[in-house]
């Protein structure tokens, strides 16, 4: 059973989002991968890898860097100098053509807020990595990670086909808040 949850990441402006998406090696190692933002009904491709993917050959599009590790079945996504307007729902996809992409788990809800002067989040080169241990409160002043709700519908079928070969999707509600380090 595969749980599909929308994962929420909260940041201050200027920080860096670093996430990873895993995929089935045998199936998708040589496929192009893309990072997309859901804007209304139409997903917007922000960056995509070259084809065929090469190990440690990063693709940079503005503030976004994608690095595919086809030997490991992982795509690394990095968004630097986050801005409030970056807030939204993002997904990694196996990019086939604009009208059919396979969504990789899990969708990411990014929330970027203004950093107040002097807080760790206000540093332009500051980086945040999600930490691991569930707790009931987030670090004061720091960015945080939550997973407060589940994905109840897939992106519009006209643009994205959600593919989960060999998996039964079980939607569950997870409400953990995760402590995170704040790097200046």
């Amino acid at each position: 059973t595969t749980e599909l949850t929308e994962e929420k990441y909260e940041y201050k402006e200027g920080q860096t989002l670093e996430v990873k998406c895993d995929y089935a090696l045998e199936k998708y190692a040589n496929s192009r991968k893309a990072w997309q933002k859901m804007e209304g009904k139409m997903p917007k491709i922000l960056a995509k890898t070259e084809r065929p993917s090469e190990n440690s050959h990063p693709v940079q599009v503005g503030r976004i860097t994608l690095e595919d590790y086809p030997d490991h079945g992982l795509l690394q996504v990095r968004m630097t100098n986050l801005q409030v307007e970056d807030s939204g729902l993002y997904q990694c996809v196996i990019y086939q053509h604009p009208k059919e992409s396979h969504v990789l788990f899990n969708p990411i809800c990014l929330v970027v807020t203004k950093g107040s002067s002097g807080t760790p989040g206000s540093s332009e080169n500051s980086t945040q990595n999600v930490y691991r241990t569930p707790s009931t409160t987030a670090k004061a002043l720091g960015p945080r990670y939550t997973s407060p709700r589940t994905v109840t519908q897939a992106p519009p079928e006209s643009t994205v086909v959600v593919s989960t070969p060999g998996s039964e999707i079980n939607l569950t509600n997870v409400t953990d808040i995760i402590r995170v380090p704040v790097f200046n």
Epitope: T2, E3, E7, E18, V19, K20, C21, D22, Y23, A24, L25, S56, E67, Y69, D71, H72, G73, L74, Q76, V77, R78, F105, N106, I108, T127, N129, V130, Y131, R132, T133, P134, Y145, S147, G166, S167, V174, D176, I178, P181, F183
Partner: antibody, heavy 122, light 107 residues
């Protein structure tokens, strides 16, 4: 209590396979990656690979590719690592370790199993 | 692969001494570095993640610093229970790699 409990020591012959289990408890099993790290006697730590217990996807370091298989059984919150075509230099303690939340590029191993000694000898 | 070079490989110090271990990466790894402690016959234990953030429950005498290629791990006042081998680990790029370890002993 968050913990990883591994299966017991194994003695096996060259060319054979070994399957080590790692049972997780005390946390949401499908939220965090499980990694495998090995350590030969008196040597340093060597990362072997990772598994996302939710998607079932996994990956391994080049030197183990084709010899290592990682699987999981979510109903019993257990991850397995099978290493085949064993050689004498595979003799080591094999650890499972919890990594970061599966969607995060955060590879710190905060919970470790007690280790499983695998001896490969003819 | 990124090579992680730890120095010294071993050291001996007195209780109360300040102990410093360095870890050098073969290329820039930002602050994607963790430090572990391993006591004989035991599994490693995470002490510091993200170059300098102390793991919950770890005594404040342990600290980490650095960014880029050069990192430092410090025990401000060595205690008898700190006898162990310490490892750094980078996670900037795959594969993840560890330093060779630094064995800390009491004089």
């Amino acid at each position: 209590q968050v913990q990883l409990v591994q299966s017991g020591a194994e003695v096996t012959k060259p060319g054979a396979s070994v399957k080590v289990s790692c049972k997780a408890s005390g946390y949401t099993f499908t939220r965090y990656d499980i990694n495998w790290v090995r350590q030969a006697t008196g040597q340093g730590l060597e990362w072997m690979g990772w598994m996302n217990p939710n998607s079932g996807n996994s990956g391994s370091v080049q030197k183990f590719r084709g010899r290592v298989t990682m699987t999981r059984n979510t109903s019993i919150t257990t991850v397995y690592m099978e290493l085949s075509s064993l050689r004498s230099d595979d003799t080591a303690v094999y650890y499972c370790a919890r990594g970061g939340i599966s969607s995060s590029w955060h590879w710190a191993f905060d919970i470790w199993g007690q280790g499983t000694m695998v001896t490969v000898s003819s | 692969d990124i090579q992680m070079t730890q120095s010294p490989s071993s050291l001996s110090a007195s209780v109360g001494d300040r102990v410093t271990i360095t870890c050098q990466a073969s290329q820039d790894i930002n602050n994607h570095l963790n430090w572990y402690q391993q006591k004989p016959g035991k599994a490693p234990k995470l002490l510091i993640y993200g170059a300098y953030t102390l793991e919950t429950g770890v005594p404040s005498r342990f600290s980490g610093s650095g960014s880029g290629t050069d990192f430092t791990f410090t025990i401000s006042s060595l205690q008898p229970e700190d006898i162990a081998t310490y490892y750094c680990q980078q996670y900037d790029k795959l594969p993840l790699t560890f330093g060779g370890g630094t064995k800390v002993e009491i004089k």
